[in-house]
């Protein structure tokens, strides 16, 4: 017998979308084989719909995919748009079609409901809204009218036109009779639970010469949208539950075991920790929709989640809801980068984000996460020169290395400084990526002046010390602006004697500056590197002042002033929420926009907050 | 909690054919999926078929030993699945246990139930 295993029938009606599961034996031989969907025909053989390798027949094109899930032993066919010629018997195989490796799979696709024996059907989602019309004719428009649910073998009252309401149904019913001119009554159920799907008999009049009309209520747990990421990507679930909850509590839940649905954000301040610093949720619109995005995928996030509405923020029966399964691909087209970059207070680090390198040319973005309320993202910097005010001579974005990672460096660093920040770009949404700084105890390895203050017309030397560990790299000055930190020339003026415990291979280097002008004003920093990859750096502020007496001016350590307090952070500031992590396009809009850039995409990056990779701040 | 209730085990003879019933009571919101499980004297429990739905759509599945002998159903009003059983032969003689859960990953797997049913015996003499 095969050891492929999967649903023997499927059974669905038109329209709709199945989803079917295959599994395999998990051998590394398996895992990387070909995967095939394919239809059996009259004599025999099996025509292949869609295959791991790419091929999709006509008769699906647009409308199925297969997603190989080797780590798992799966894989998955997904078929939208179902017709009544999708019906027939069909193999899901591995290898070749004609080979033993399959399982056979019987597709039946019905007509949808519509009216029975007079019976109108209504089809509707699990805590939505229905309205059941029940006409009549003009010689019961003074009588009772009536709704009853059929019981077993017995018909229930749920609501009349008297006023009695059954307590199953209080508060999420009404029965409304139409003006004179309608001979229709209509009763409407709100918040519609998964007990009230059955039948119901409305009815105007009491004796032998009442209205009758019967009605089917089917209610639907919504179908679970299939979603698959990548490992370290990103997901956004955008949900949508319409304007009659607008003013609801929303929320966002991972099914565990059971009935239980853990929370893991709602818009009323609850987050799980296992999603700190990965996760936003988008203040809703109008309409009541909202999404949440979570970066950093790790393979335990995958599984069914749930977004709806109600007034505790977690699910509970007659709560509209919205489903998912998510699946985390192992196999990831993102790659491994650090999950924590550590620094020590007054020093530096150099963050590695990670992009689609088929996205040289996207715009570049750093942004800081904020835990407050629903969690935001205020941007910080990007690749186009725009640098948030604070930041100012202490961050800077850097396109190098290059062909699918550029490289953020944050220097003078405080406690303030300690969070999660996220990488991002305008182009691939699934390339969001999540970085926690972490301060530690410790000196800078760089050491340089405090401020420093150069005579205009006169000659400035800046030393920098650089410890014998990083006499293999290249050492470098450079003059911050906001576009980046442009290279100067600079001296090696020998070994530095400000480290104990260090040889020859220490190094003092310092930048001149001659014949200083008012635009030598500015931050500069010294630093480390090997090849593109950037290391540790340090900063100085030069300021220019009138010529007070002649000479040129050599800074020492001792001489230097202190660092000045760090800037207040600015009110206009940018960051990603509300529509435009929705709206990709809105950054590209932006530019037109005035300096104050109030508003910006969470366009799509991604995190590996699973793995417990860390980097130091000194080195790479 | 969901609580379920089996019935329709009995004595019958070879050949002949049994229907079981499944009750599902109480909070049935996240379970998509619901099936049947056997354990015969001395061996373990063991995967007999499994009905998993997604709105208006059913997925079927079944062990070899039992294909093309029995057929599970549901019957989404009455929130109850039912396993039909026919040409029974002496080596299906078991307790046969109903479950229930949101089933997720591979049906065949007890783990992905989180309710059990308290069994319901079938024995099929020869």
């Known amino acids: 017998k095969s050891p492929i295993f999967g649903p023997e029938e499927v059974n669905s009606v038109e329209g709709n979308s199945v989803s079917i599961t295959c599994y395999y034996p998990p051998t590394s031989v398996n895992r990387h084989t070909r995967k095939y969907w394919c239809r059996q025909g009259a004599r025999g053989g099996c025509i292949t719909l869609i295959s791991s390798e790419g091929y999709v027949s006509s008769k699906y094109a647009g409308r199925a995919n297969l997603t190989n899930f080797p780590e798992n032993g799966t894989f998955v066919v997904n078929i939208a748009q179902l017709s009544q010629d999708d019906s027939g018997r069909y193999k899901c195989g591995l290898g070749i079609n004609s080979r033993g490796l399959s399982f056979d799979v019987s597709l039946e696709v019905s007509q949808g409901p519509g009216l029975l024996n007079d019976t109108k059907v209504y089809t509707v989602d699990l805590g939505r809204t229905v309205t059941i019309n029940c006409p009549f004719k003009t010689e019961n428009a003074q009588k009772r009218k009536s709704l009853y649910k059929q019981i077993g073998l017995y018909p229930v009252l749920v609501i009349d036109s008297s006023g009695y309401v059954n307590p199953n149904y209080t508060g999420r019913i009404r029965l409304d009779i139409q003006g004179t001119g309608q001979l229709l009554f209509s009763v409407v159920i709100n918040q519609l639970r998964l007990s009230d799907a059955g039948q119901y008999l409305c009815q105007a009049g009491d004796d032998s010469n009442s209205n009758k009309k019967n009605a089917d209520l089917q209610v639907l747990k919504p179908e679970p949208e299939l979603v698959y990421e990548d490992l370290r990507g990103s997901v956004t679930f955008h949900c949508a539950l319409g304007p009659e909850v607008a003013n609801v509590a929303k929320f966002l839940c991972r099914q565990s075991s059971g009935e239980n649905c853990d929370v893991v954000v709602n818009t009323l301040g609850k987050r799980a920790p296992a999603f700190e610093g990965r996760i936003l949720l988008n203040p809703q619109d109008k309409d009541g929709s909202f999404s949440v995005v979570i970066t950093g995928l790790r393979k335990e996030d995958a599984g069914r989640y749930l977004c709806g509405a109600h007034s505790d923020g977690q699910l509970q029966e007659g709560s509209p809801i919205q489903a998912w399964q998510l699946f985390v691909n192992e196999e990831s087209t993102i790659p491994r980068s650090p999950t924590v970059v550590k620094g020590v207070a007054g020093g530096s680090v150099a963050v590695l984000c990670p992009y689609n390198r088929k996205e040289s040319k996207s715009i570049k973005y750093w942004c800081l996460w904020e835990g407050a309320q629903n969690g935001r993202c205020p941007l910080l910097v990007d690749s186009e020169g725009w640098v948030k005010a604070q930041y100012e001579g202490r961050l800077s974005l850097l396109e190098e290395p290059g062909n699918g990672t550029f490289t953020v460096i944050l220097n003078q660093l405080t406690s303030r400084d300690a969070g999660f920040y996220w990488c991002l770009t305008n182009g691939d949404t699934l390339w969001r990526t999540t970085v926690e700084i972490k301060i530690i105890e410790g000196e800078p390895n760089l050491k340089v002046p405090g401020n420093v203050t150069a005579v205009l017309g006169e000659t400035l030397k800046v030393p920098c010390h650089f410890p014998c560990k990083f006499s293999s790299y290249e050492k470098y000055w450079c003059k911050w602006n906001n576009t980046g930190c442009q290279a100067l020339p600079s001296q090696d003026e020998g070994p530095s004697k400000a480290f104990v415990n260090c040889d020859e291979n220490s190094r003092l280097v310092s930048l001149t500056l001659n014949l200083v002008t008012r635009a030598d004003e500015g931050w500069y920093w010294c630093g480390v590197k090997q090849g593109h990859f950037y290391g540790e750096t340090a900063a100085v502020y030069v300021a220019v002042e009138e010529r007070k007496a002649a000479g040129s001016r050599d800074v020492s350590l001792a001489k230097a002033d202190a660092a000045p307090d760090e800037k207040v952070l600015d009110s206009g500031f940018r960051e990603i929420e509300n529509k435009a992590i929705q709206d990709p396009r809105l950054f590209a809009e932006e530019k037109a926009v005035a300096d104050t850039r109030d508003q910006a995409d969470g366009s799509r990056a991604s995190v590996d907050s699973g793995s417990s990779e860390e980097q130091g701040g000194s080195s790479r | 909690e969901v609580q379920l209730v089996e019935s329709g085990g009995g004595l019958v003879q070879a050949g002949d054919s049994l229907r079981l019933s499944c009750a599902a009571s109480?909070?049935?919101?996240?379970?998509?999926?619901m099936g049947w499980f056997r354990q015969a004297p001395g061996k373990e429990r063991e995967f007999v078929a499994t009905?998993?739905?997604?709105?208006?759509?059913?997925?079927?599945y079944y062990a070899d030993s039992v294909k093309g002998r029995f057929t599970i159903s549901r019957d989404n009003a009455k929130n109850t699945v039912y396993l039909q059983m026919n040409s029974l032969k002496p080596e299906d003689t078991a307790v046969y246990y109903c479950?229930?859960?949101?089933?997720?990953?591979?049906?065949?797997?007890?783990?992905?139930?989180?309710?059990w049913g308290q069994g319901t015996l079938v024995t099929v003499s020869s």
């Open positions: 009905i998993k739905w997604s709105g208006s759509t059913n997925y079927k």
């Open positions: 479950a229930a859960g949101t089933v997720l990953g591979d049906p065949r797997v007890l783990n992905e139930y989180d309710y």
């Open positions: 109480g909070r049935t919101l996240t379970t998509y999926g």
